[in-house]
């Protein structure tokens, strides 16, 4: 469909208007002007950027640009009293320390503030003893020490690699198997790629290189002091006691040089197998304790950081909908970042920068969107999502009438291989389309659409001929838009090829040599990937605010919840003989899917044919599309997880960034065959499969016709 | 109720491969190491290698390396051992074993290799 | 690898007496032993882990000691069914190594 569709709209006003607007040597400046002095939420320097932003979108032509401010928890490290861990001897004494803060990286040795590496929220704490290596500290890690190694992590100090999940369910798993204390480091394993350099002769990590990352377990809660509410003026705080989501022992992380240092003493048992040894010259002994000579050495951990209830600043910019004001497409990233975020968050907001102006540009020419935008610069992401989900609390009423659609953007780039979308299947036939009608960057692609390149690259493994589009989880700012307010949401990145490239994110991630320089020298010296991502990101916003008939397709989630139903069925059926035993159907389940599976398809031919010149027709049937995500949310919200109330997506319980579909069946079944009163777990899973089967019946009466 | 049941005897020619299978049940199959153990007639045990056969990771002793395979298969909860190029000497028992501490123990197989 | 010795190698023992069987690591292994009853014909069964832990069902006749490199099992009184060749296995690294065991008999 053609997009010149709204009001005193002139025909080179369009899509393709914007998207040429849209120029690297652009993105770039943004991205030099972000990160040449660090970012960190709550900080002076942070405060300023909010404020040149807010500029500079007003300069661009936003119609208005406000700061919403949030007092929240937020947690630094005690300047006169840094953390670190020791190897003590039998005296007590010191015979080890681990480094203080990352050798700064060139041109940078006289930066200040720059905050050395700590783990948001930890506890302070001097615990000691002996070490337990617990692999990356995942669910069935803990599994594998505790049932079939019969390895007890009571007591003890584990030391976790960093990757395939959550820090924060690592500290968790820590805690629930009893540990106290948590040293967490960056295997090379995972962050160092074979034949590249480490930094600052290429993009890996070297050995002083420290990921810094807040562990809290906050299942969208915000504010750890104000959960569902927003932390303003006149808030009433939690104590620290109460407390959301702070973990109960102390967190360190370290780099590999050090890591080393910790684990070459290792003696216990052997490792289980290949899957628990990484690239150093140790031999990944899992303890507990130290091996022989060193057996009476044990390790210390001095953590001094505070908890501080901090002020901080989200951008919120406003281009106004010339025919649906009251509609809002919303476009947001962070902004704060751990040292000079020069792929997190700002690849990101440089692209939203450049988004903002383009937008702007084409309305100085008189052109606006049909819907309004939403334009946010959010504060405090890296300490748990606080300035989305606190602004989100404070406009829940509006957004939860008014929210067509959310766009994330975090880093723009995670690699430079191929494109990597995750979303709301809602959104599905608007990327294909999209990407479709926007030239690859790729090389040996030359003259190919994006489509092709990244379905060649990433091909989806159920339908061929169309590419990966993966499952929303959390770890960014969408989380309370989708997984809280039920907004359809979605998020696009340039990453690497996950097929040779098995290290966890990129290797620099969250450490000080994420500089301007690693992005500008080897990761999109051209910039053409980060304009693609702007492209995409910023193509998804024009359509969503100013197509006529909103560019979401419920029959692709029909296709979704047959496939998650078939799936999570598939899990339960692995207990013929207790599901016999406690009489367990999925056929109400099945039943709702075939229902919203015939209604969606009939919505889809009323949406074909209806009079797109009648406004209230119009509007009627937008409005289904809009609220058929809402549709999914539950009030009552997932078993001890209240403010994760999308019934068919959720972050995983073991591992936040991961979604999980139809997560409340998905609960109630792990581990069941554990559990000490089956009765009681298989009724569980029934009522989960009760409240599935009735929310994708109820949300498949939404799209039937109104009367 | 742990069980083990391992796949009958074997009789093989010098230079061929023996594949043992090990069915298990009565615990979660992914939770468990499975070892691979062998004992030749009056001799001590030799541990060959071992698998987590939730995401099949091994390790396998180095006397063994490039003639030993262990796999396994999840929707069936058995293990496999694979021995090729065999030699008179690997005339043994071949005992699989569930548990990083060999907690439960398969009842042999019998491999006889002779020309 | 790690070499694990056990002595004696064989052991006869009059029922209701003690058998203290020995096994010594060739370097420290810490308390990363595991023991082993294995009777006639029969695959072997797990007695001990972690040096001195029991395993479910075992009776508490029998014990495990040690660490670093020296292990004991003791069986405090020895009845009819104990007879059975032993053997101690490390786990602190790889290959995982097994004693050559030791056979205990009734005198």
């Known amino acids: 469909k053609s997009s010149n569709e709204a009001t005193n709209i002139t025909p080179k006003h369009n899509m393709k208007a914007f998207l040429d607007e849209l120029k690297a040597e652009n993105i770039k400046k943004f991205l030099y002007n972000f990160t040449q002095i660090p970012h960190l939420a709550g900080t002076e320097q942070n405060f300023q950027l909010a404020k040149q932003i807010q500029s500079q979108w007003k300069e661009f032509g936003l119609d208005s640009v406000e700061l919403a401010h949030y007092d929240v928890l937020l947690s630094y490290p005690n300047k006169t009293h840094p953390n670190y861990i020791s190897i003590i001897n039998e005296d007590g004494n010191e015979i080890f320390n681990t480094s203080l803060f990352e050798p700064p990286p060139p041109g940078y040795e006289n930066v200040s503030d720059i905050v050395p590496p700590f783990s948001a929220f930890s506890p302070q704490g001097m615990p000691e003893g002996d070490l337990v290596y617990v692999n990356y500290a995942r669910t069935e890690d803990f599994f594998k020490l505790e049932r079939d190694m019969k390895i007890n992590c009571s007591g003890k100090i584990v030391i976790a690699r960093y990757g395939k999940v959550f820090r924060g369910n690592k500290v968790k798993n820590a805690q629930l198997a009893g540990a106290k204390g948590v040293i967490l480091y960056s295997d090379p394993a995972d962050y160092f790629a074979p034949g590249v350099k480490s930094y600052p002769d290429g993009w890996n990590l070297p050995g002083g290189g420290v990921q810094r990352g807040n562990i809290l377990n906050l299942n969208g809660a915000g504010d750890p002091l104000t959960p569902g509410y927003p932390a303003n003026e006149y808030a009433y705080r939690r104590g620290i006691a109460e407390a959301v989501g702070l973990p109960s022992i102390p967190v360190h992380p370290i780099g590999y040089y050090d890591a080393q240092k910790l684990l070459e003493k290792m003696g216990g048992s052997a490792p289980p197998d290949s899957s628990w040894r990484g690239s150093l010259k140790v031999p990944y002994n899992v303890g507990p304790g130290f091996t022989g000579n060193f057996s009476t050495q044990k390790v210390k951990m001095h953590i001094h950081s505070t908890n501080e209830v901090t002020r901080i600043y989200n951008v919120i910019g406003t281009l106004r909908g010339a025919v649906e004001p009251d509609r809002y497409v919303i476009l947001g990233g962070h902004r704060d970042s751990w040292v000079f975020g020069g792929i997190d968050p700002q690849s990101g907001a440089a692209v939203v920068h450049e988004i903002v102006r383009s937008f702007g540009t084409l309305k100085k020419e008189g052109w606006r969107p049909r819907r309004t935008i939403l334009f946010a610069s959010w504060d405090a992401e890296e300490f748990g999502l606080l300035g989305s989900t606190e602004w989100a609390e404070e406009n829940s009423r509006l957004l939860q009438e008014r929210g067509v659609a959310y766009i994330n953007a975090d880093s723009s780039i995670e690699g430079n291989y191929t494109l990597r979308v995750d979303c709301t299947p809602l959104m599905y036939s608007l990327v294909h389309n999209l990407t479709k009608e926007l030239k690859s960057p790729d090389e040996g692609f030359e003259g190919k659409s994006l489509y092709e390149s990244w379905t060649k690259k990433s091909p989806s493994p159920e339908f061929s001929g169309m590419p990966r589009i993966s499952k929303l989880g959390s770890g960014n700012d969408f989380e309370v838009f989708f997984q809280r307010l039920g907004i359809a949401s979605g998020r696009a990145r340039y990453t690497k090829n996950w097929e040779t490239n098995k290290f966890s994110g990129y290797p620099l991630y969250h450490s000080v040599y994420e500089t301007y320089e690693l992005v500008e020298k080897f990761y999109d010296p051209m910039f053409k990937y980060h304009l693609t991502v702007a492209q995409v990101r910023g193509g998804m916003v024009f359509e969503l605010a100013n197509s006529i008939v909103l560019p979401f397709d419920c029959r692709d989630y029909a296709v979704v919840l047959r496939k998650y139903a078939d799936k999570i069925y598939s899990i339960s059926m692995k207990h013929p003989q207790e599901m016999k035993t406690y009489s367990v159907s999925f056929d109400s389940l099945f039943s709702a899917v075939k229902n919203f599976t015939e209604i969606a398809s009939k919505f889809s031919e009323r949406l074909q044919d209806f009079d797109k010149s009648n406004p209230i027709v119009l509007r009627m049937m937008n409005d289904q599309l809009m609220f058929l995500e809402r549709a999914f949310i539950d009030p009552l919200g997932l078993p001890d997880r209240p403010f994760y109330r999308h019934v068919i997506y959720a972050p995983s319980s073991h591992n936040k960034y991961a979604g999980e579909s139809f997560p409340g069946i998905y609960d109630a079944l792990f581990d069941i065959e554990s559990k000490v009163d089956p009765s009681k777990a298989w009724g569980e899973v029934k009522r989960q499969i009760y409240v599935a089967a009735f929310t994708v019946q109820a949300a498949a009466e939404t799209l039937s016709e109104v009367a | 109720e742990v069980q083990l049941v391992q796949s009958g005897a074997e009789v093989k020619k010098p230079g061929a491969s023996v594949k043992v299978s090990c069915k298990t049940s009565?615990?979660?199959?992914?939770?468990?190491?499975i070892h691979w153990v062998r004992q030749a007639p009056g001799q001590s045990l030799e541990w060959m290698g071992n698998i987590n056969p939730n995401n099949g990771g091994t390790t396998y002793n180095q006397k063994f390396q490039g003639r030993v395979t262990i796999t396994v298969d999840k929707s069936t909860s058995t293990a496999y051992m694979e021995l090729s190029s065999l030699r008179s000497e690997d005339t043994a028992v071949y005992y699989c074993?569930?548990?990083?501490?060999?907690?439960?123990w398969g009842q042999g197989t019998l491999v006889t290799v002779s020309s | 690898d790690i070499v694990m010795t056990q002595s004696p190698d064989s052991l006869a023992v009059s029922l209701g007496e003690r058998a203290t069987l020995s096994c010594r690591a060739s370097?420290?292994?810490?308390?990363?032993v595991d023991w082993y009853q294995q009777k006639p014909d029969q695959s072997p069964k797990l007695l001990i882990y972690?040096?001195?832990t029991r395993h479910t069902g075992v009776p508490d006749r029998f014990t495990g000691s040690g660490s670093g490199t020296d292990f004991t099992l003791t069986i405090s009184s020895l009845q009819a069914e104990d007879v059975a060749v032993y053997f101690c296995?490390?786990?602190?690294?790889?290959?995982?190594?097994f004693g050559a065991g030791t056979k205990v008999e009734i005198k």
């Open positions: 972690w040096a001195s």
């Open positions: 074993a569930a548990g990083w501490n060999f907690d439960y």
């Open positions: 009565g615990y979660t199959f992914t939770e468990y190491t």
């Open positions: 370097q420290d292994v810490g308390t990363a």
């Open positions: 296995q490390q786990i602190n690294s790889y290959p995982l190594t």
